[in-house]
């Protein structure tokens, strides 16, 4: 049989002869020489050879447990003589023997980690991980133990974990916000002559709210024109937060003050800037200085800091209104004024008001556009606003005269302002009735008394408040003997009537009657009118056949007989 | 040319008051803020308040509140400064300032009046 | 509230020499600054508006700048009238003077 222990080589010989493994012997050899040892299997003849007489096996190069910690060969045993074994072929094993050779080598080169600022103590970080090559089951050579080189005293590692903690209390990101911190990692636990490998973690303080927005001033001036609409921007303020992000952003409010009313604060998302605006409608002339409190505040708050103080700042705002010359003011925004028609020239008819809004109360004068009073009708005086007639007026001519009155800060030319003015003029019965139209009338000659050959009708330019009443006559001069009468209607019309039966138009062609046509108002005005009446021979129906021309070619006037 | 005139120097007891007045010439009254300045025997400069005589409205030093009253009158274009409840620290040199802007509450000082000593002692 | 602080708070020149008077506001007051020159028993005269702007009148030795916080007068040559009392006054909200700063004879 066989007779050999495990065989064991220790790795990475480094000796000028070949390193002895072991023997191999069977008890069948009686070191005469008659038996033959065979090697075959892992290496065989090549990392290992055997004395083919005495077993001896020896390791021809320097092995790596790492590479290969064990090789599987078979050995024989051959009697020379017959070629026959002399034991059955066996397999063994040889063992690679461990040495530390190798150092712990962290799974990265480069670690990257944040954690945030303002953590407690023993906050988790990072785990970093080592691993050794050489054999944990054997002595130390993979024990390996962490440590930490370079970032005391602000992080920690566990010396058998690789987690890493902070260390220090307080670690403020706006103090310092990069940490590089080198952690060993060493073999035989940590023992002297053990073997090393480092890695650097690059560690981040995150950002957390334990910074208050601040004003980097108390007080704030901004001026702004008293016409400045309601949303229009006066200034920007900006408090400053040494946090970032979400914890950065700040919301403006106005808290106190008397312009709380009177002015808005909008927070810009993109600067963090506090846009102070004009809320409502200003006046110079009621309040020139406003003072505000605004606060910036922090929208997102960690409770956990709350104790550090308020996360809000307040700054005072003064708004100084800046006065804007306003032009002057009209107590109406259109006057009606009315005069008679007859009004002699420099009658008043009314007066304007107008005021300058300013503190200031600038003097105002007073004139009339002359491009809507191209005839100089009307004038003003420029003093206390009073308007008064420069021409005489007619209604019948123009009714209404539409003027525009300019009022003038008498300091500042500029400031001006305009006001329409309606004035109407009031009738006067200053006009006479007249014949609506040139009447000429025809009579037949066989006509018969009483009969209507005509109806008058009158007009007059006037308006009278009750309407018009006319009253129709003929003229004293031709109302005895006439051989027409006139038939007052007593509704603006009258007629014309014959008289007598029959007309011969041989003997008189054609009548010229005066009419006296007068109104009911006061004073009274009355006119004459002529009515040519012409004689004509009618059939016996009353068509007329013909008349004489005659009438075309008398004289104006009252002709015999009429 | 712009003209401050002011009154002449009082001598009063504590606890009286007193009223400064300021005659201006030379420009509109109404339209220009004129402002209230003292200066204690030795001392710097301390702003009191103003006035904008155009409306009469003012606006005061807190330290003075409720013991400086400020009017004018557009008539006579003079401003006065009324101070009461007088006490010794109140000795000064009181004057009154046109502020340069005419409509704006702000701005400097550009034309000051000669000044009037109030004394305030027992 | 504004505080105005004026260095120094008095010097001695001679006739021809520059003199350089200081003023720092605690807060930025931007260009917001005026120089007055008061002689005994008379009132303040103004030298300086908007930090840097020669109000009409005054000679042109005078001379101010700074924007902010910090502001300086200067007197290119000093002449015998202008030995005097020299104030800064911020207006940038409300109205404050410096202690001023009291120019004398060497």
């Known amino acids: 049989s066989w007779m050999w222990n495990q065989f064991f080589l220790l790795e990475e010989y480094t000796g000028s002869d070949y390193q002895y493994v072991g023997k191999l012997h069977s008890d069948q050899d009686r070191g005469d020489g008659s038996l033959k040892y065979i090697l075959s299997g892992d290496g065989a003849g090549d990392l290992f050879i055997i004395n083919e007489n005495t077993g001896d096996i020896q390791a021809t190069k320097r092995l790596d447990r790492e590479e290969k910690p064990v090789y599987i060969l078979r050995a024989q045993a051959i009697n020379r003589r017959t070629g026959r074994p002399v034991e059955p072929e066996s397999e063994f094993i040889i063992k690679i023997h461990d040495i530390n050779d190798n150092e712990p080598i962290f799974t990265k080169e480069v670690y990257t980690a944040t954690v945030p600022e303002m953590s407690d103590v023993g906050t988790f970080v990072v785990q970093v991980t080592a691993t050794d090559a050489d054999d944990p089951t054997y002595g130390n050579s993979a024990k390996v133990v962490y440590s930490i080189l370079q970032g005391q005293p602000y992080f920690s590692v566990e010396s058998e974990t690789g987690i890493i903690k902070t260390a220090l209390l307080n670690m403020d990101r706006e103090n310092r916000e990069q940490y590089q911190v080198v952690i060993q990692a060493k073999d035989m636990g940590g023992q002297m002559g053990g073997l090393s490998g480092t890695t650097t973690v690059n560690i981040t303080l995150t950002d957390v709210n334990d910074n208050p927005p601040r004003f980097p001033q108390s007080t704030y001036q901004f001026k702004t024109p008293e016409s400045s609409p309601p949303g229009t921007p006066i200034g920007r303020i900006k408090a400053s937060d040494a946090d970032v992000g979400e914890n950065a952003e700040i919301e403006y409010s106005i808290t106190d003050g008397e312009g709380l009313d009177m002015f808005d604060v909008i927070t810009d998302q993109e600067t963090q800037e506090g846009i102070i605006t004009v809320k409502k409608l200003l006046d110079f002339e009621k309040k020139k200085v406003y003072t505000l409190k605004v606060e910036a505040s922090n929208p997102h708050v960690e409770p956990r800091f709350l104790y550090l103080g308020p996360f809000k700042d307040s700054a005072t705002v003064r708004i100084v209104v800046e006065d804007v010359d306003e032009p002057p003011v009209f107590s109406k925004l259109a006057y009606i004024l009315q005069i008679r028609e007859d009004a002699q020239i420099n009658t008043t008819i009314g007066s304007v008001t107008a005021q300058d809004p300013d503190a200031a109360r600038n003097p105002v004068k007073y004139s009339v556009d002359r491009h809507t009073d191209m005839d100089r009708i009307f004038n003003i005086d420029s003093g206390n606003g009073s308007i008064f007639t420069s021409k005489l007026l007619d209604r019948e001519t123009l009714l209404w005269h539409n003027i525009t009155v300019i009022a003038t800060e008498i300091n500042n030319p500029k400031q001006s302002s305009r006001v329409p003015l309606y004035i109407k003029v009031l009738d006067v019965n200053d006009n006479a009735p007249e014949f609506a139209e040139f009447y000429e009338t025809f009579v037949c000659e066989k006509a018969k008394a009483d009969q209507l050959i005509q109806t008058l009708r009158a007009v007059d330019k006037d308006d009278p408040y009750s309407g018009h009443q006319f009253s129709f006559s003929l003229a004293p001069e031709a109302a005895s003997g006439s051989n027409f009468t006139i038939q007052d209607n007593k509704d603006n019309t009258a007629g014309i009537l014959t008289r007598k039966n029959g007309y011969n138009r041989h003997e008189m062609s054609t009548y010229l009657l005066p009419v006296v046509i007068s109104d009911n108002d006061y004073p009274v005005q009355s006119s004459t009118g002529t009515v040519t009446v012409r004689v004509c021979a009618c059939d016996h129906h009353g068509n007329m056949q013909s008349c004489h021309a005659e009438a075309l070619i008398h004289p104006t006037g009252l002709s015999t007989g009429a | 040319e712009v003209q401050l005139v002011q009154s002449g120097a009082e001598v009063k007891k504590p606890g009286a008051s007193v009223k400064v007045s300021c005659k201006a010439s030379?420009?509109?009254?109404?339209?220009?803020?004129m402002h209230w300045v003292r200066q204690a025997p030795g001392q710097g400069l301390e702003w009191m308040g103003w006035i904008y005589p155009g409306d009469g409205e003012t606006e005061y030093n807190q330290k003075f509140q409720g013991r400086v009253t400020i009017t004018a009158d557009r008539s006579t274009s003079t401003a006065y400064m009324e101070l009461s409840s007088l006490r010794s620290e109140d000795t000064a040199v009181y004057f009154c300032?046109?502020?340069?802007?005419?409509?704006?509450?702000?701005?400097?000082?550009?034309?000051w009046g000669q000044g009037t000593l109030v004394t305030v002692s027992s | 509230d504004i505080q105005m602080t004026q260095s120094p708070s008095s010097l001695s020149a001679s006739v021809g020499d520059r003199v350089t008077i200081t003023c720092k506001a605690s807060q930025n007051i931007y260009k917001n600054l005026a120089w007055y020159q008061q002689k005994l028993g008379e009132g303040p005269k103004l030298l300086i508006y908007d930090a840097n702007t020669l109000q009409t009148g005054v000679p042109s030795r005078f001379s101010g700048s700074g924007s902010g916080t910090d502001f300086t007068l200067t007197i290119s040559s000093l002449q015998p009238e202008d030995f005097a009392t020299y104030y800064c006054?911020?207006?940038?909200?409300?109205?404050?003077f410096g202690q001023g700063t009291k120019v004398e004879i060497k």
């Open positions: 030379g420009y509109t009254f109404t339209r220009n803020f």
């Open positions: 006054q911020q207006y940038y909200s409300g109205w404050a």
């Open positions: 300032a046109r502020g340069v802007y005419g409509g704006f509450a702000g701005g400097y000082f550009d034309f």
